[in-house]
Interface confidence: low
Amino acid sequence: FVRTKIDTTENLLNTEVHSSPAQRWSMQVPPEVSAEAGDAAVLPCTFTHPHRHYDGPLTAIWRAGEPYAGPQVFRCAAARGSELCQTALSLHGRFRLLGNPRRNDLSLRVERLALADDRRYFCRVEFAGDVHDRYESRHGVRLHVTAAPRIVNISVLPSPAHAFRALCTAEGEPPPALAWSGPALGNSLAAVRSPREGHGHLVTAELPALTHDGRYTCTAANSLGRSEASVYLFRFHGASGAST
């Protein structure tokens, strides 16, 4: 990016000098912030810049996924001399600026966290006016969202040779351990696929062959809690159907 060398409050400001915080661009973000699903989290971000006393227009931006190219989740703009940063974008209305960009603070609050929010976030500030300059954190802050287990799907499906199999899918962070219990099973970990490709918080456990009628219960547990769901298998003997 282009850095201006002229600053109206200094005769000449060499922005390449890195000797003091006031004379260089830098951003301070923690590598990671942890919070539970449903709660709120603060993503801290403060910065220093070489343009002393800058009070021109500025834009504060947060993006997700990757720096420079990831989708924006929050954007606000402050007019010249104003300390109010007017929100122009807040994805799903859940992102709110906590900091004051005029005071070098871009800290963001994320409301009603979901597991899908578990990703890396990058703060960015843009100056426009007499000075045209911008800076973005390269590493960003990883938002680690934890969640108690939730069983998202439990089902009985037909399998070859008039048999039936049961599937249980749960989500949580840390990814939950799954166990099946039911007729003649005791407690079985069954065939666990963990986690599903591209779905880091989803875990699926399969019971490949249900040999007895009755109630089959899937239990999902992690360090934050446990969840149970049941499915019933009643076969019409002499027929190939089942009631679940």
Epitope: P21, P31, E32, P44, L98, S137, H139
Partner: antibody
Framework: QVQLQQSGAELVRPGTSVQMSCKAA????????IGWVKQRPGHGLEWVGD????????NNNEKFRGKATLTADTSSSTAYMQLRGLTSDDSAIYYC???????????????WGQGTSVTVSS | QIILSQSPALLSASPGEKVTMTCRAS?????MYWYQQKPGSSPKPWIY???NLTSGVPARFSGSGSGTSYSLTISRVEAEDAATYFC?????????FGGGSRLEIR
């Protein structure tokens, strides 16, 4: 130049509390994190937590939850750590350090205080 | 948490020798950081982001590695290098340090 000046050694009774300080000079206190590190002989270095005075935000090592409380006073550019319910396991040297989290693509504890020695003894 | 294991715990070398100390992580980390500590003094940042020397660190020091295995090497040891060296990771909380490798000069 950047300096972190820590408070003096403490000799305290088991079950009591202690508060130590870390006074920063030579840089803008509200622009950087201050980290706290515990060192016991034979136990190496252990991260306790850190605080950003500019936004009063803390990161804590879960191991020290309920044991250590981090605060900062921006008017005096001083960070504090309070330890409570002291036992002999808390006898150690505690360092404060300035943490530069995102500059030149790296994280680093770039300046350290001289350490505060805490001895817990009856 | 990520556990960092340093070896050897104690190294003894003569001036001019080459020494290498290693730091192994219990799970993969992106970078490793190294600090030098002399008796009675605070730790000093020595190497950041695996291979970058902090200001004032002699060029005879180098850092390398990736994933779970990292090392600090001194090409030609000098008497002033006698110290304990700690590795540290910022990859995931809690940030952790290794137990240290103490270098003594014969």
């Amino acid at each position: 130049q950047v300096q972190l000046q820590q408070s003096g050694a403490e000799l305290v009774r088991p079950g009591t509390s202690v508060q130590m300080s870390c006074k920063a000079a030579g840089y803008t206190f509200t622009n950087y994190w201050i980290g706290w590190v515990k060192q016991r002989p034979g136990h190496g270095l252990e991260w306790v937590g850190d605080i950003h005075p500019g936004i009063n935000y803390t990161n804590n090592n879960e191991k020290f939850r309920g044991k250590a409380t981090l605060t900062a006073d921006t008017s005096s550019s001083t960070a504090y750590m309070q330890l409570r319910g002291l036992t002999s396991d808390d006898s150690a040297i505690y360092y404060c350090a300035r943490v530069d989290y995102d500059y030149d693509g790296s994280y680093i504890m770039d300046y350290w205080g001289q350490g505060t020695s805490v001895t817990v003894s009856s | 948490q990520i556990i960092l294991s340093q070896s050897p715990a104690l190294l003894s070398a003569s001036p001019g020798e080459k020494v290498t100390m290693t730091c192994r992580a219990s799970s993969s980390v992106s970078y490793m950081y190294w600090y030098q500590q002399k008796p009675g003094s605070s730790p000093k940042p020595w190497i950041y982001a695996t291979s970058n020397l902090t200001s004032g660190v002699p060029a005879r020091f180098s850092g390398s590695g990736s994933g779970t295995s990292y090392s600090l090497t001194i090409s030609r040891v000098e008497a002033e290098d006698a110290a304990t060296y700690f590795c540290q990771q910022w990859n995931s909380k809690p940030w952790t340090f290794g137990g240290g490798s103490r270098l003594e000069i014969r």
